[in-house]
């Protein structure tokens, strides 16, 4: 996360950080006790690594009572994502059991109206991806509150150039972000998830390159029907 | 398949005014910016402006700022051009397109015939 | 204005031939963001403009790929390997990085 700032302790019991041999690669959302939503490229970086989840966390590095790493059942990347473009970048990752819920660990309700979200609303984008340029990665969970920005804006030639199809949805960019190590990650509008960070290799920080985001009611029915 | 549909040819008196329309199908109006070029005969093109179709915003090459007035329909999808103190030097084909990927779809072009 | 200068004004091809179009602007066209739009557009007679190249170098989907741009800060450069019947037009050069966004004058592609 760029231009943001540390994010409460725990005050986001719903996100996950999806490790490969105990390292962060992105973020995640619990959206059901064994489910966690994530970006579907992220599984490319995995390569033949051990995929686990870290729930309850708000450091990655210190001992904390409500954290715990849960190995994955099964990965399920959308079925038309593909490694070249950025479309239907989701991913769900089934634990190997049920969640131990509580205060610091708790699915998020996830949008199913397929609605834009009015442009210019203030949305919660948290996760542990780089904080500068330089690549630094934080310890502990970060977060930035984004406008959304409209998506004829986002298509513009300067901005994405006609890649943001109605399944995706754009946030501003200027200085403050989502970056590398935050795909997967959640967008929150209002208390409910609208969007999955998407894991291309955007320049981070620059207001003509707005972040990209999954726009989860665009796939309310599959999802359904892979938590079914 | 994405179109864009412009109103037919005018031949308007000068000192009239002049709107004409540009009708989006086959994608989502909202999604993207339109654009409006004019192009004289035998000449090259010139940007006129551009229109966010979702907040009506505008932005004008200067040159057609007192000249040019872009607006939308959002309901039909529809984006309008007018043109006013039409002198002989307005006579153009005048052409839409949409933004994104670049200046990729472009409507067949409206001839405005400015004459006595 | 950032004023885009394209030589020759005509150009006489034998089809099968190869063509080269120059294009230069009065400034850098790299855009605050980094890249460069620097496109190149073809009219054919009585039809309105095609896109064949974005971002100085990239094909619009299904342009053949006998058609290349290149070129860098203020010059540019399309290239056609093996011209075609299909070829003939006018092909234009335009930037998108500065506003207003503005065309080349143009440059007539035509049979020997």
């Known amino acids: 996360i760029l231009g943001g700032r540390e994010a409460e302790a725990h005050a986001r019991p719903y996100m996950a950080s999806v490790q490969v041999n105990g390292e962060h690669l992105c973020g995640g959302v619990l959206v059901a006790e064994q489910w966690v939503l994530s970006a579907a490229h992220c599984l490319e970086d995995a390569a033949d690594g051990k995929v686990q989840v870290l729930l309850g966390a708000h450091s990655l590095s210190q001992p904390e009572p409500s954290k715990r790493l849960y190995d994955v059942l099964r990965a399920v990347p959308h079925p038309d994502s593909r490694p070249d473009t950025i479309d239907h970048d989701l991913l769900l990752l089934q634990l190997s059991e049920k969640a131990t819920l509580g205060p610091a660990v708790r699915p998020l309700p996830w949008q199913r109206v397929d609605r834009d979200v009015e442009p210019g609303t203030l949305c919660d984008v948290a996760g542990w991806g780089i904080v500068s340029h330089a690549g630094r990665r934080p310890d502990r969970l970060q977060h930035v509150l984004l406008p959304v920005l409209d998506r004829a804006t986002c298509n513009r030639r300067t901005h994405h150039d006609g890649a943001i199809t109605q399944r995706m949805m754009c946030a501003e960019s200027n200085r403050r972000d989502s970056c590398k190590g935050d795909s997967g990650g959640p967008l929150v509008c209002g208390g409910v998830l609208e969007g999955v960070v998407t894991s291309g290799s955007r320049v981070c920080g620059n207001r003509k390159k707005p972040g990209i985001y999954t726009r989860v009611a665009s796939y309310a029915a599959w999802i359904d029907s892979v938590l079914a | 398949e994405v179109q864009l549909q412009q109103s037919g040819p005018e031949l308007v008196k000068p000192g009239a005014s002049v709107k004409i329309s540009c009708k989006a199908s086959?994608?989502?109006?909202?999604?993207?910016?339109t654009n409006w070029m004019r192009q004289r005969h035998g000449e090259s093109l010139e940007w006129i402006g551009d229109i966010n179709p979702n907040t009506g915003d505008t932005s004008y090459n200067q040159k057609f700022r007192v000249k040019a007035t872009l607006t939308v329909d959002k309901s039909s999808g529809t984006a309008y051009m007018g043109l006013r103190s039409l002198t002989s030097e307005d006579s153009a084909v005048y052409y839409c397109t949409r933004e994104g990927p670049s200046f990729a779809y472009w409507g067949q072009g409206t001839l405005v015939t400015v004459s006595a | 204005d950032v004023l885009m200068t394209q030589t020759p004004l005509s150009l006489p091809v034998s089809l099968g031939d190869q063509a080269s179009i120059s294009c230069r602007s009065s400034q850098t066209i790299v855009h605050s963001n980094g890249d460069t739009y620097l496109e190149w557009y073809l009219q054919k007679p009585g039809q309105s403009p095609n896109l064949l190249i974005y971002?100085?170098?990239n094909r619009f989907s299904g342009v053949p790929d006998r058609f290349s741009g290149s070129g860098s800060g203020t010059d540019f450069t399309l290239k056609i390997s093996r011209v075609e019947a299909e070829d003939l037009g006018v092909y234009y050069c335009f930037q998108g990085s500065h506003v207003p966004p503005t065309f080349g004058g143009g440059t007539t592609l035509e049979i020997k």
């Open positions: 086959g994608y989502t109006f909202t999604d993207y910016y």
């Open positions: 971002k100085v170098s």
